[in-house]
Interface confidence: medium
């Protein structure tokens, strides 16, 4: 267990950037920061869950830009951003810092939030090391910050996985509790016998493995128990031989502000009441005015620091602050073996060759396995397919017999005859053309520019 700490030093236009301020809104506004930690060095969507934790800074001082005045040193929020982590520090991580502007009013009033900058830093960092300084550019902006990871006692080490024990192995008095305070100096591994339990064994000489009371075995992994007092923890009582409850991770309740403690293997977990968070429920004072609900979550309650707030999350998000994105790809929306990508603002399917469409639902090669009946031919294109039917047939698969005369294609009283290659119109006197659409003028000249050779007015006209 431990805490990642981030200190923002400055935020403003970078060298060569426009001489403008992030406060250039149409009214008073203030800055705040959000930090998001993800394990590993992989490229991830900015909206993917902050698996190692996230934190929101306090709001900075309210600032109103003075027209034509040079931008002063920008007022930033006070204090550190702290992200508690319960488990081992991973060493490699992605750090995402977002700078937000809260606009407190303009001609149409009310606050609004704009994401000014988002910087992502991927690197390796050992817990317990010194502050690491950094300067990052985001567009025209420059962010200067420092950060470190530190373990919280009794955890120590570069990953906060070793438990610190006093160098002098003290004996316990009547309270059956360890009586020496934890010291900064810890046993340097590997002094004890290989495999000696880190939790229940200790050593004063290299190569030995001595057990804390209540544990036995060559590596101190076997709990001492008797039939009359199974399951109890702690050193055995000399009078009864039973285990007397000894020190446990939840003894003394490390959870502040009414949090309830539950034991986890070798550690503890605090379930915090609403309005509090952190490893020990020590972080409080967040109200709806601080905008604790991310991703469009609706904040209710929490009008003052003493009352709790609740985030009602929009579809697709969860977590007490709506900070976790539901994995929408788990529903397997992409068909035909397409690869699902949750981009945050939308789902995308990367289709396999031969498939297309928003969900890869169109088979571009469908003609390979598609038969068009009655001499029809399959036509591909545009991510879809269709049958081009032979004359006299129609429908999706060319299985329906089409009556070319059903639509009464012959004009001016012409009579329609179905023909193997289409239809033929026998025109009424005075009309000609493939559909009898052209009147023959009294002087015997038709309205056609030129009649095909050998055709006389009144002749049947074949419609190809």
């Amino acid at each position: 267990a431990g805490v990642f700490e981030l200190q923002i030093h400055s935020f403003g236009p970078g060298p060569g950037g426009a001489p403008r301020s992030p406060y250039s809104a149409r009214g008073p506004c203030r800055l705040f920061f959000r930090v998001c930690l993800k394990p590993g060095l992989s490229e991830e969507a900015a909206e993917s869950p902050c698996a190692l934790g996230a934190a929101l800074s306090a709001r900075g001082p309210v600032y109103t830009e003075q027209p034509e005045a040079p931008a002063p040193d920008l007022p930033l929020p006070n204090g550190l951003l702290q992200v508690p982590f319960r488990d081992a520090w991973p060493g490699t991580f992605s750090l995402i810092i977002e700078t937000w502007r809260e606009e407190l009013g303009d001609q149409i009033g009310g606050p609004a939030w704009s994401l000014l900058a988002r910087v992502t830093r991927r690197r390796r960092l050992a817990a317990g090391g010194p502050w690491a300084g950094d300067i990052q550019r985001a567009g025209a902006w420059e962010l200067r910050f420092s950060y470190r990871a530190r373990c919280e006692l009794p955890a120590v080490g570069t990953a906060c996985t070793r438990l610190c024990r006093p160098r002098s192995a003290s004996r316990c008095g009547p309270g059956l509790r360890p009586c020496a305070p934890l010291e900064d100096e810890c046993e340097a591994p590997p002094v004890c016998r290989a495999g000696c339990s880190l939790e229940h064994g200790f050593c004063e000489q290299p190569g030995e493995c001595r057990c804390l009371e209540g544990w036995t075995g060559p590596l101190c992994m076997v709990p001492v128990s008797t039939s009359s007092c199974l399951g109890l923890r702690g050193p055995s009582s000399t009078t009864t031989g039973c285990l007397v409850p000894g020190p446990g991770p939840c003894d003394g309740n490390p959870c502040a502000n009414g949090g309830s403690c539950s034991e986890t293997p070798g550690s503890f977990e605090c379930t915090c009441p609403r309005g509090f968070y952190g490893l020990r429920c020590e972080v409080s004072g967040v109200t709806c005015a601080d905008g604790p609900c991310f991703n469009g979550g609706l904040c209710v309650g929490g009008a003052d620091p003493d009352s709790a707030y609740i985030c009602h999350c929009p579809p697709g998000f969860q977590g007490s602050n709506c900070e976790k994105r539901v994995d929408r790809c788990s529903l397997q929306p992409c068909r035909n073996g397409g690869l699902c990508l949750d981009l945050g603002h939308a789902l995308r399917c990367r289709c396999r060759a031969g498939f297309a469409g928003p969900r890869c639902e169109h088979d571009l090669n469908d003609c390979a396995g598609r038969a068009c009946a009655n001499g029809g031919t399959c036509v591909e294109g545009g991510g879809a397919h269709r049958c081009s039917c032979a004359l006299g047939f129609g429908g999706r698969d060319c299985r329906e017999r089409a009556d070319p005369c059903a639509a009464r294609p012959c004009a001016h009283g012409g009579r329609c005859y179905a023909h193997f290659s289409g239809l033929v119109c026998a025109c009424a006197p005075g009309y000609m053309g493939a559909r009898c659409e052209f009147p023959v003028h009294p002087d015997g000249v038709s309205a056609l520019p030129a009649a095909p050779p050998g055709l006389r007015p009144g002749d049947p006209q074949r419609y190809p």
């Epitope: 606050p111 704009s114 994401l115 000014l116 988002r118 902006w141």
Partner: nanobody, 116 residues
């Protein structure tokens, strides 16, 4: 490339309703505040409404309060301006504007005419 396209304008009688839609592509839609502006002939462009990048905050000009409703769908990269009880003085070209600290994108506008 960046595209901002407004639609849904048209001719409507006083007291009627219209929903303007604004579709965008080519940029990180969900990080932008969206403003709707309008410009009537011979007048300056005025801001009618705005919605924050997350959709949690909406603000309206006095002329639009109680009649207009602005919403956004970040999954579809769309913004909607629902206009009810329209008046002749709402006649204007309506523009969709995406605003962020480092950039500004405008559409070409859609004409709304309120007339009997």
């Amino acid at each position: 490339q960046v595209q901002v396209v407004e639609s849904g304008g048209g001719l409507v009688q006083p007291g009627g309703s219209l929903t303007l839609s604004c579709a965008a592509s080519g940029f990180d839609f969900s990080t932008y505040t969206v403003n709707w502006y309008r410009q009537a002939p011979g007048k300056e462009r005025e801001k009618v409404a705005r919605i924050s990048s997350t959709g949690t905050t909406t603000n309206y000009a006095n002329s639009a309060k109680g009649r207009f409703t602005l919403s956004r769908d970040n999954a579809k990269n769309r913004v909607y301006l629902q206009m009810n009880n329209l008046k002749p003085e709402d006649t204007a070209v309506y523009f969709c504007n995406f605003e962020r600290f480092d950039s500004n994108y405008w559409g070409q506008g859609t004409q709304v005419t309120v007339s009997s």
